[in-house]
């Protein structure tokens, strides 16, 4: 796996341990927590990043209305089970044998149950809505400049193909970034929208996962854009299954 050869580090994931023990003395990096080898030329999967995080020491209406099936990650951090490819396993359980089903971004999509709970497949999150509110500025940002800059950022920093940035909506001070990626659209080597959204979320919080690349510095025509709150909604290819009790 490619990593910075000279000092053997992983530019795309600081939560790794790297050593020149790959084939031919090449730098190889393994994710903390899981010990899985990671490809440092692309983003690391959210599942492996969450696992690494848990292993680390504690320290006129143009805006989109999320559908009734949109999920928000209210459960927060947990130590996930990842498959050999680094994806979330469909069923996650905690140490007290409480289990639940998750989608491809690791967000719970069913009520919690016991060890008998079945999660037949990992349901893909095909639409992510990132809702940002920026700090007050002298004037509104130009919408097309903002759109172009966010697309550039997702392409360069998160390596997400521009076709997966479906839209950028703007009603000062709210910015919404829509990411869409169906199973059929995602080719081998394409960054997953869930991974890109997670890196972006961590960047926005000032917790960059990149190494040697500085924090997120978002600017539109040279004007810094500072985000003061973020909400992320996840829409799955199959709607989630929660009991009515949760919905009331």
């Amino acid at each position: 796996h490619t990593a910075a050869q000279d000092n053997c580090t992983c530019p795309t994931n600081k939560m790794t341990v790297c050593s020149p023990d790959g084939p031919g003395g090449r730098c190889q990096c393994r994710a903390l927590g899981s010990g899985m080898a990671v490809d440092c030329s692309t983003l690391t999967s959210k599942c492996l990043l969450l696992k690494a995080r848990m292993s680390a020491p504690k320290n006129a209406r143009t805006l989109v209305r999320p559908s009734e099936h949109a999920l928000v990650d209210n459960d927060g951090l947990y130590d996930p089970d990842c498959d050999p490819e680094g994806r979330f396993k469909a069923r996650q359980c905690n140490q007290t044998s409480v289990c639940w089903c998750v989608n491809s971004v690791g967000v719970r999509r069913t009520d919690k149950g016991d060890l008998s709970l079945r999660c037949d497949e990992l349901v893909r999150t095909h639409h992510i809505l990132i809702d940002l509110r920026h700090r007050p500025t002298a004037g509104a940002f130009n919408h097309s400049d903002l759109d172009a800059e966010l697309r550039r950022l997702f392409r360069e920093r998160y390596r997400l193909h521009p076709k997966f940035v479906a839209a950028v909506h703007y009603e000062q001070p709210t910015i919404q970034i829509e990411l869409r990626q169906n199973t059929s659209q995602k080719a081998a080597g394409d960054v997953d929208i869930g991974d890109a959204a997670y890196y972006f979320e961590r960047d926005i919080k000032g917790e960059s996962l990149f190494q040697g690349r500085g924090g997120l510095d978002l600017r539109v025509r040279g004007e810094p854009l500072q985000v003061e709150r973020t909400l992320i909604y996840y829409l799955d290819e199959i709607p989630p299954k929660f009991s009515m009790k949760r919905l009331t």
Partner: antibody, heavy 121, light 107 residues
């Protein structure tokens, strides 16, 4: 308009130190990083390091560590490059250049006019 | 460190010619590559950033492309003022590095 104005040419003896200044105007100093690049006579461009003017944290190229100090005075919107233990190979034009604070903006959109530092006994 | 290898190191062309300069990174740098033009005795000027984004005020005859490790700067129709030295630079990770330069001369 956005401008970076550097201090004048310097002639130094081997072993001495030099301090080059770069005064920024036309924008809010702390919203952009300041990079330093040098160019030896007839040679290419060599990155020396940069400073995040917002946090005040500098980062240096490995070849210059221990010899270079990059600093910034936000009250005067001025960045400084100090190079010590000068050798004849340090004879070059030294440029300051503006960039963003994150890697997606580590390209240099505005440059100073350059400061020629000559090291000669 | 990431090495940026530019080719050719020098190039002779005529006004009106289409010219392509290439830059190869020693490892994947996404689209984090910039191109500069430098004339004798002057500071470099930014032409392209993020591989393909033309900087404000740069004529449309200049274009950039590429991602990963291979990048190109194209001048579609050379003008007399375009004869200069051109440098690529990655802006992916520190340390930042430049290509060795391509000198574009009049044939």
């Amino acid at each position: 308009q956005v401008q970076l104005v550097q201090s004048g040419a310097e002639v130094k003896k081997p072993g001495a130190s030099v301090k080059v200044s770069c005064k920024a105007s036309g924008y809010t100093f702390t919203t952009a990083g300041m990079q330093w690049v040098r160019q030896a006579p007839g040679q290419g461009l060599e990155w020396m390091g940069w400073i995040n003017t917002h946090s005040g944290v500098p980062k240096y190229a490995e070849d210059f560590k221990g010899r270079v100090t990059i600093s910034a005075d936000t009250s005067t919107s001025t960045a400084y490059l100090q190079l010590s233990s000068l050798k004849s190979e340090d004879t070059a034009v030294y440029y300051c250049a503006r960039s963003g604070h994150g890697s997606s903006y580590w390209y240099f959109d505005v440059w100073g006019q350059g400061t020629l530092v000559t090291v000669s006994s | 460190d990431i090495q940026m290898t530019q080719s050719p190191s020098s190039l002779s062309a005529s006004v009106g010619d289409r010219v392509t300069i290439t830059c190869k990174a020693s490892q994947d740098v996404s689209t984090a590559v910039a191109w500069y033009q430098q004339k004798p005795g002057k500071a470099p000027k930014l032409l392209i950033y993020s591989a393909s984004y033309r900087y404000t005020g740069v004529p449309s005859r200049f274009s950039g492309s590429g991602s990963g490790t291979d990048f190109t700067l194209t001048i579609s129709s050379l003008q007399p003022e375009d004869f200069a030295v051109y440098y690529c630079q990655h802006h992916y990770i520190t340390p930042l590095t430049f290509g060795q330069g391509t000198k574009l001369e009049i044939k």
